[in-house]
Amino acid sequence: FERTRSLQDPCSNCPAGTFCDNNRNQICSPCPPNSFSSAGGQRTCDICRQCKGVFRTRKECSSTSNAECDCTPGFHCLGAGCSMCEQDCKQGQELTKKGCKDCCFGTFNDQKRGICRPWTNCSLDGKSVLVNGTKERDVVCGPSPADLSPGASSVTPPAPAREPGHSPQ
C-alpha cells in the first residue's frame, strides 16, 4: 500500500524537515531558515514561533520541530504551548482557575507557586501551638503542656502574629 501511495503521490516520500516543492516538480526541498515541518508529506513548512517580550526561548526551532517558549522569571506559562504568561502568585496565595486567590483560613503557602496547605495540627503529635499560623506561614508546634511540668523551664508565649491564626485542634 505504501508503495502504491508513493507512486500516486510523490509528496508522501518527503520526510519531516522538508516540503514537497510544487515549483520544482514536486522535489523534496529542505525547509527554509526559520521554518519547520514536523511530519512527512507536507506541501509547506510552518513559520517558527518567535519567543519575544515576556516569552523566552526554552527550545530553539529546528527543521523538524517548532520553537518552544516559556515565561521570564516572575511569570509562568498558561495555555497549550505557553500562549500566555501569568504573574506568579504572592506568598499566602494559591493559583486557581480564576487566578491568584488568598489562602483560606487554616491554610498557608510559603512559596510563590503551588497550593495552600493546611496548618500542622500540633495536637496530633501531643504538642501545643507555640506560634500561630498565617496565610504565609505554618504554625510552630511547641512542647506538649505535660512537658511543662513544675520546675521545667517555662516557654515565654510569643507576641501575637500580625495575622493571628489558630491551629485546627
Epitope: 518567535q50 517580550g53 515576556v54 511569570f75 495555555g79 500562549s83 500566555m84 501569568e86 482557575k97
Partner: antibody, heavy 116, light 107 residues
Framework: QVQLVQSGAEVVKPGASVKLSCKAS????????MHWIRQAPGQGLGWIGA????????DYNQKFKDRATLTADTSISTAYMELSRLRSDDTAVYYC?????????WGQGTLVTVSS | DIQMTQSPSSLSASVGDRVTITCRAS??????LNWYQQKPGGAVKLLIY???RLHSGVPSRFSGSGSGTDYTLTISSLQPEDFATYFC?????????FGGGTKVEIR
C-alpha cells in the same frame, strides 16, 4: 504601579505624518512587547502592530504595514508609533498596551484628528 | 485572519440583572480569549484572560467560560459601574483581532 502614559491629542492634515509616544513606568520596559491598537469614532478596536523593545523586532497588521513604523527607546522606556500618509479615516484614538498574551495595562489613548 | 463575532451588539439591562455576552471565533482559538471593558471616557481595562481567569482587582461577579470557537462573558449581578462596552479578543494568532463590542446600557 505599572503605567503607560501617552502623548497629547494631535490635529494633522491629510497626507502628513504623526508620531505618537507611550512612556512606560513601574516595570522593566524591555521585557514586554508593546502593541498599538486604534479605535475610530463609534467603532471597535483594531490591532496595528507590536514591537519587542529589547530587539526592535516588529510585527504589523498587513493593513498598516506600509504606513506604520514602530520604534522604542529603552533608555527612556518609551515606545513610538509613526503613521504616514494620513487620511481622514485614520481619525481615531490610538492606544499602546503591554502584552502578556493578553493586554493587561493600557495607555489612556491619544486622539488623532485628520482634517484639512 | 481570525474573525471574532460578538453578540449582541447592544443590550439594555437593569441593576441586579444577570448579563451574558457571547463571542464566536472563525476557528479554534484553544482558550486564548480575553475580555475587556471600555468606559465612555475611553479607558480600556482587562477583565478576564485565558477564557476564565479574573484579572487582579476585577469583581467576582464577572466570569468567563468557553472552549474551541465559542466563549461567554457573564456578569452575575449587574452593578451601576458595569454599564460600559465589552470586547472579546483572541491571542491565538497574529494579527490579534477583537469582537465588534457589546454596549451594555441602562434599561
Amino acid at each position: 504601579q505599572v503605567q503607560l502614559v501617552q502623548s497629547g491629542a494631535e490635529v494633522v492634515k491629510p497626507g502628513a505624518s504623526v508620531k505618537l509616544s507611550c512612556k512606560a513606568s513601574g516595570y522593566t520596559f524591555a521585557g514586554f512587547e508593546m502593541h498599538w491598537i486604534r479605535q475610530a469614532p463609534g467603532q471597535g478596536l483594531g490591532w496595528i502592530g507590536a514591537i519587542d523593545p529589547k530587539t526592535g523586532g516588529t510585527d504589523y497588521n498587513q493593513k498598516f504595514k506600509d504606513r506604520a513604523t514602530l520604534t522604542a527607546d529603552t533608555s527612556i522606556s518609551t515606545a513610538y508609533m509613526e503613521l504616514s500618509r494620513l487620511r481622514s479615516d485614520d481619525t481615531a484614538v490610538y492606544y499602546c498596551t503591554r502584552d502578556l498574551g493578553y493586554f493587561d495595562v493600557w495607555g489612556q489613548g491619544t486622539l488623532v484628528t485628520v482634517s484639512s | 485572519d481570525i474573525q471574532m463575532t460578538q453578540s449582541p451588539s447592544s443590550l439594555s439591562a437593569s441593576v441586579g440583572d444577570r448579563v451574558t455576552i457571547t463571542c464566536r471565533a472563525s476557528q479554534d482559538i484553544r482558550s486564548n480569549l480575553n475580555w475587556y471593558q471600555q468606559k465612555p471616557g475611553g479607558a480600556v481595562k482587562l477583565l478576564i484572560y485565558y477564557t476564565s481567569r479574573l484579572h487582579s482587582g476585577v469583581p467576582s461577579r464577572f466570569s468567563g467560560s468557553g472552549s474551541g470557537t465559542d466563549y461567554t462573558l457573564t456578569i452575575s449581578s449587574l452593578q451601576p459601574e458595569d454599564f460600559a462596552t465589552y470586547f472579546c479578543q483572541q491571542s491565538e494568532k497574529l494579527p490579534r483581532t477583537f469582537g465588534g463590542g457589546t454596549k451594555v446600557e441602562i434599561r
